[in-house]
């Protein structure tokens, strides 16, 4: 028998520095977790103690903090090289800055293979990107070889900016021939490493013949055997065992997100490459694990540029950006309109001639807006200003909801109107009329939404049974501010870009902004 230790991360999302327990900015260092310096300590400890170790990443290193905003992926290549990752799969967020934003900072700089079997380049890009990412890689580990085959969510064109010269194929269809190829090369230990979410990970384990282990990402799935060490609730045991169609027991793993845990899986293979046993657990990277001093020193060196960046001008406003609670928790506010417009703009994807865009709607809890911006400061808007407006370090996510769920959400928005509570919704691509003289739960008298399957966008009444795409804060997708109906009834949820980054990118692109209050939210009494 031959034993392999797989160490794995996924959805790190730019958390190079240690974070608080909820993966936001570290406030009390003695209680902080994760970060590459701490991760390196644990990885090195395991490398010294065990003979056959692979360190793998299942994608979405890009996007999530000011580190990515400033360094644009160079930080990912640098620190992953320093940690000596053995392989990485491409995630959807690796395409957030377009293909060029992937090629230059990461693909050309990484000293480890970057993988995806179901992304096929065409046209002029094919030669430019050739060899920079691979469908699979055979890695020598001790006296053996292990095949790693990569995959990426086929929804990436809707979630990021891969352009028109990359085709995202069905994962299972694309993986099978690559695994077959590995088998013909006498590679009998094969790991599928990818970024399509836990449901697809399980399908790959079930359907792709020859895959021994699946290491996934995208769904931020936390698996654990026994008593979990922090606040994440396990979605199942670690590893999650799937019985494949040909009768094998295939371990599937994922390690939550944000570098909070290091996935730790021990696999025992027989001489024919069959998995005899698998066991392990994610390791919580808490403050009992010291940060590696040399990596920490490097982090501190790279940090300097971030501090300078936060006070630089991103763009200008020629109007007062009203982010006051008096406005945003009671009525339409132009700060809410600005943020929603930025959220929609960040999700412009012309992927189908029938649609001007795949999503037109935004909702945003007024309580998530935390500061106005005064235009009398020469109109200057900085990252620092935006961090006061959006201080909670969230993301703006894409969900699919039925019209009936949206109607419930808008009723919830005003169910206790008048108390300066955070659930009052700011909107984009939506016209809503409330009648506060009616009883709570029956106050939405008009709800029109901007069409997507149209060449000239116009507002049509919301249809209760129709499925709509909506951009919203992850806080709402997780049921925050009492929006339990969103959490309970959402049909799909893909995590998006860092909130401040979305707004800062929009302001930089527009250069000068002047958002208005324009009748997106109205109040009436009496008949309609």
């Amino acid at each position: 028998a031959w034993e392999l230790t797989i160490l794995h991360t996924n959805d790190v999302h730019s958390r190079l520095e240690q974070t608080s327990e909820d993966s936001s900015k570290c406030v009390n260092a003695s209680r902080c977790m994760g970060g590459v310096a701490r991760l390196f300590t644990k990885v090195q400890q395991i490398r010294r103690a065990e003979p056959n170790v692979l360190l793998l990443d299942a994608g979405d290193q890009y996007q999530g903090t000011i580190w990515f905003t400033v360094y644009k992926g160079a930080e990912v290549a640098h620190f992953m090289n320093a940690l000596r990752y053995d392989a990485m799969a491409l995630g959807n967020h690796e395409f957030d800055n377009g293909v060029e934003g992937l090629i230059e900072p990461l693909l050309k700089e990484a000293k480890f293979p970057i993988l995806s079997a179901n992304i096929k380049a065409k046209g002029p890009l094919a030669s430019q990107i050739s060899g920079l990412y691979l469908p699979y890689k055979v890695l020598p580990v001790g006296d053996e070889v292990v095949g790693i085959v990569g995959y990426t969510s086929k929804e990436t064109p809707f979630l990021s900016n891969p352009g028109t010269n990359l085709v995202f194929e069905d994962e299972i269809t694309a993986l099978q021939p690559e695994v077959d190829k590995l088998k013909t090369l006498n590679v009998n230990k094969i790991i599928a490493l990818g970024h399509s979410g836990f449901e697809m990970d399980k399908l790959i384990a079930q359907k792709v013949r020859g895959v021994d282990v699946v290491v996934g990402g995208h769904s931020n799935t936390f698996l654990y055997t026994g008593n979990p060490p922090s606040k994440e609730v396990p979605a199942g045991k670690y590893p999650f065992i799937v019985t494949s169609d040909d009768g094998r027991k295939v371990p599937v793993v994922q390690a939550y997100a944000f570098g909070k845990y290091l996935g730790y899986l021990k696999i025992e293979f027989d001489e024919r490459g069959n998995v005899i046993s698998s066991h392990g657990n994610p390791i919580l990277l808490n403050s009992s694990i010291p940060e590696d001093p040399s990596i920490k020193a490097d982090i501190n060196k790279w940090r300097i540029k971030l501090d300078n960046y936060s006070t630089q001008e991103l763009g200008k406003t020629i109007v007062y950006l009203d982010g006051s609670s008096q406005s945003c928790r009671f009525r339409e506010c132009n700060m809410g309109n600005l943020i929603c417009d930025a959220m929609i703009n960040n999700n412009l994807r012309h992927t189908d001639e029938m649609f001007w865009n795949h999503v037109s709607m935004c909702i945003l809890n007024g309580g998530g807006i935390r500061s106005p911006i005064d235009e009398r400061n020469n109109g200057t808007i900085t990252w620092e200003n935006l961090a006061a407006v959006l201080p909670f370090g969230g993301t703006f996510d894409l969900v699919q909801l039925k019209g009936s769920t949206l109607k419930k959400a808008f009723e919830h928005s005003v169910h206790r109107y008048g108390q300066s509570t955070g659930e009052f919704l700011q909107v984009g691509g939506i016209h809503v009329v409330y009648d506060l003289s009616r009883k709570p739960g029956d106050r939405v008298v008009k709800l029109d939404v901007l069409c997507t399957k149209c060449r000239v966008p116009s507002y049509d009444p919301l249809k209760m049974d129709e499925v709509y795409k909506v951009i919203l804060p992850n806080f709402l997708a997780n049921g925050g501010d009492g929006f339990q109906m969103i959490k309970d009834e959402l049909l799909r949820h893909d995590s998006g870009d860092q909130d401040i980054n979305v707004v800062s990118t929009y302001i930089s692109k527009m250069k000068v902004i002047y958002p208005a209050v324009e009748g997106r939210i109205k109040f009436s009494t009496g008949s309609h």
Partner: antibody, heavy 117, light 106 residues
Framework: EVQLVESGGGLVQPGGSLRLSCAAS????????MHWVRQAPGKGLEWVAV????????YYADSVKGRFTISRDNSKNALYLQMNSLRAEDTAVYYC??????????WGQGTLVTVSS | AIQMTQSPSSLSASVGDRVTITCRAS??????LAWYQQKPGKAPKLLIY???TLQSGVPSRFSGSGSGTDFTLTISSLQPEDFATYYC????????FGQGTRLEIK
């Protein structure tokens, strides 16, 4: 490290006034709604007042309405509670606290106000 | 104002016991409920918010449930450091605390 430090407590006669201060550090004070909560000796917690992050909304418990005024100075990271027409039943430890927000909540260690002749 | 009634007002238990404290609101408050722990001479500490969401750094032996008017705080296996006073607080309207439940060693 997040810190909230209350000050200004002390002994005051019935009908008198006192101004409590709360100095905040370690977080973006101007982005948080802030509360005052009190606890009479040997008794439970009683919410007193709240002020929104930028100061435009204020709410008070019925027991203090018209007598107490909450205010803040975001440039100084400071929260205040002006207490007038004090009564014996206002004797308590007064805590300032952030709202329960996306990053949890924080409380100071309290300052004791004693109203007695 | 919405009133909060906690029960029991005090209870004795042993290390390792499972303990349940209940809180009833005088009218529906959806899930706008928090639970706090307070030790003598100390500020309250948030345990649970939104009725069932565990605050960062709080051990998983604490859990909350309920919606509407009836809520429960459960400590699955009491530890020595859990002996304290527990308060519920509604934030559906202007905040209001329950009268507290004192948990002491049997």
């Amino acid at each position: 490290e997040v810190q909230l430090v209350e000050s200004g407590g002390g002994l005051v006669q019935p009908g008198g006034s006192l101004r409590l201060s709360c100095a905040a550090s370690g977080f973006t004070f101007s982005s948080y709604d802030m509360h005052w909560v009190r606890q009479a000796p040997g008794k439970g917690l009683e919410w007193v007042a709240v002020m929104s992050y930028e100061g435009s909304n204020k709410y008070y418990a019925d027991s203090v309405k018209g007598r107490f005024t909450i205010s803040r100075d975001n440039s100084k990271n400071a929260l205040y509670l002006q207490m007038n027409s004090l009564r014996a039943e206002d004797t308590a430890v007064y805590y300032c606290a952030t709202e329960i927000a996306a990053k949890g909540d924080y409380w100071g260690q309290g300052t004791l106000v004693t109203v007695s002749s | 104002a919405i009133q909060m009634t906690q029960s029991p007002s005090s209870l004795s238990a042993s290390v390792g016991d499972r303990v349940t404290i209940t809180c009833r609101a005088s009218q529906g408050i959806s899930n706008y409920l928090a639970w706090y722990q307070q030790k003598p001479g100390k500020a309250p500490k948030l345990l649970i918010y939104a009725a069932s969401t565990l605050q960062s750094g709080v051990p998983s032996r604490f859990s909350g449930s309920g919606s509407g008017t009836d809520f429960t705080l459960t400590i699955s296996s009491l530890q020595p450091e859990d002996f304290a006073t527990y308060y519920c607080q509604q934030s559906y309207s202007t905040p209001h605390f329950g009268q507290g439940t004192r948990l002491e060693i049997k």
